[in-house]
């Protein structure tokens, strides 16, 4: 039986930070898991992975490329991210993995969220220089 | 029996303008057919449309939003999308249906493709007015 | 039918690295459903679980060899591997690949196991 | 992690025997009334061979005087009338935690 999971559809984030909720259909603190995110239409790319369970919040380890942390209670993840530039736009899907004890269970993949990080664009005006 | 669908997993634009190819696992020219673009994680907004057969080349049309036109050969219909602008980055996905004859055929939910439309910043700089 | 077979053992050097593989016949790795666990057991001694890698490609590994250790696999090959670092005496063994389902995670199928013995 | 203790370490009988051979956790491994604790049999140069399965469910192929029960902490494995094949090694193992634990074996040998 798959667990579902729901996430917001986009987040535009002009600063260079966001927080992304992963709502899931199952409580978290019922058997050890193993959260991440996961970036690109194929998921390519693992952006951010925590385990966990009842007994101790989970460390959180990012992909070279990125920044991450990570929080939940009984039925959200939430993964942020920092340091993000415009080429991190992309679409991130939430996944979660519940392995101990058994049996294994994992999420249907859900539609993802599209993060467009806007560009920062600051127009010096050009100050002739003093002699 | 469902079509496959392939598309590029993102397009970055510079320009305002984008060619989205759709190719499919079967062949156009054997029914009449419908293609249209999606935007959104859930495919919220038919972006544009085309309705085409072996005997004539479709007529696009696309939602208000957006500028569109298509085109199509045996396997492939491309999608060209102008005048966009920062906001239309987001996931597209490529939907074809087979009409007649029967039997109805569709295709299987792609991964879609991601467009992101980069902004283009142009700094003036400020020229004191003459008196 | 499902088969396991590992290959790679052999002699190596103290402060070494190996790499064992599994090639897995009868059943894909990166489908739903299955597991593959590595085992190992000294001359004479117990057994003694190393770590295992899910369809999905998640890990997890045994505290006492996390630092050393590497599982991961070819999809396109059927066929897991495992690596581990900074040899030592006590790492000699039979090496085994076991595949485990999703609902219990009991170990049904087995490989013929591969020795490593190190030492200069 | 979760210790397994398994008793006797050895012991020794006859074809036709009934033998008793015990595994204790440190901890129980019971989840939704499953007992995620199994049962290998493994005879000198071969790889192990799964015997029984949560607890109590014999693996398909094995022969019936095969058999395991308990829950929580405390499970048995049981051959009704031990034969000349079943001199071996005999491992329980838990999965209801990681790291996935070993009891440290029983030997059965003929006396």
């Known amino acids: 039986n798959k667990i579902l999971v729901k996430q917001s559809p986009l987040l535009v984030v002009d600063s260079n930070e966001v927080s992304l909720s992963c709502r899931y259909s199952y409580n978290l603190l019922a058997k050890e898991f193993r959260a991440s995110l996961y970036k690109g239409v194929n998921s390519d790319v693992e952006v951010c992975v925590g385990n966990g369970n009842f007994t101790y919040q989970p460390q959180f380890r990012s992909n070279a490329e990125f920044n991450c942390d990570g929080d939940f209670d009984n039925e959200t993840v939430t993964f942020r991210l920092w340091n993000l530039h415009v080429n991190h736009t992309d679409i991130y899907f939430c996944k979660i993995e519940f392995m101990y004890p058994p049996p294994y269970l994992d999420n249907e993949r859900s539609n993802g969220t599209i993060i467009h990080i806007k560009e920062k664009h600051l127009c010096h005006t050009q100050s002739s220089p003093k002699l | 029996n469902k079509i496959l669908v392939k598309q590029s997993p993102l397009l970055v634009v510079d320009s305002n303008e984008v060619s989205l190819s759709c190719r499919y696992s079967y062949n156009l020219l054997a029914k009449e057919f419908r293609a249209s673009l999606y935007k959104g994680v859930n495919s919220d907004v038919e972006v544009c449309v085309g309705n085409g057969n072996f005997t004539y080349q479709p007529q696009f049309r696309s939602n208000a939003e957006f500028n569109c036109d298509g085109d199509f050969d045996n396997e492939t219909v491309t999608f060209r999308l102008w005048n966009l602008h920062v906001n239309h980055t987001d996931i597209y996905f490529c939907k074809i249906e087979f009409m007649y004859p029967p039997p109805y055929l569709d295709n299987e939910r792609s991964n879609g493709t991601i467009i992101h439309i980069k902004e283009k910043h142009l700094c003036h700089t400020q020229s004191s007015p003459k008196l | 039918e499902v088969q396991l077979v590992e290959s790679g053992g052999g002699l190596v050097q103290p402060g070494g690295s190996l790499r064992l593989s599994c090639a897995a016949s009868?059943?894909?790795?990166?489908?739903?459903?299955?597991?593959v666990s590595w085992i190992r057991q000294a001359p004479g001694k117990g057994l003694e679980w190393i770590g295992e890698i899910y369809h999905s490609g998640s890990t997890y590994y045994s505290p006492s060899l996390k630092s050393r250790v590497t599982i991961s696999r070819d999809n396109s090959k059927n066929t897991l591997y495992l690596q581990l670092n900074s040899l030592r005496a006590e790492d000699t063994a039979v090496y085994y690949c076991?595949?485990?389902?999703?609902?219990?995670?009991?170990?049904?199928?087995w490989g013929q196991g591969t020795l490593v013995t190190v030492s200069s | 992690d979760i210790q397994l203790t398994q008793s006797p370490s050895s012991l020794s009988a006859s074809v036709g025997d009934r033998v008793t051979i015990t595994c204790r956790a440190s901890?129980?491994?019971?989840?939704?009334?499953?007992?995620?604790l199994h049962w290998y049999q493994q005879k000198p140069g071969k790889a192990p061979k799964l015997l029984i399965y949560a607890a109590s469910s014999l693996q398909s192929g094995v022969p019936s005087r095969f058999s395991g029960s308990g829950s929580g902490t405390d499970f048995t494995l049981t051959i009704s009338s031990l034969q000349p094949e079943d001199f071996a090694t005999y491992y329980c193992?838990?999965?209801?935690?990681?790291?996935?634990?070993f009891g440290q074996g029983t030997k059965v040998e003929i006396k």
């Open positions: 009868g059943f894909s790795l990166s489908t739903g459903g299955v597991g």
């Open positions: 193992q838990q999965s209801y935690r990681s790291p996935r634990t």
């Open positions: 901890q129980s491994v019971d989840f939704h009334g499953i007992s995620f």
């Open positions: 076991a595949r485990y389902e999703y609902y219990y995670y009991d170990f049904d199928y």
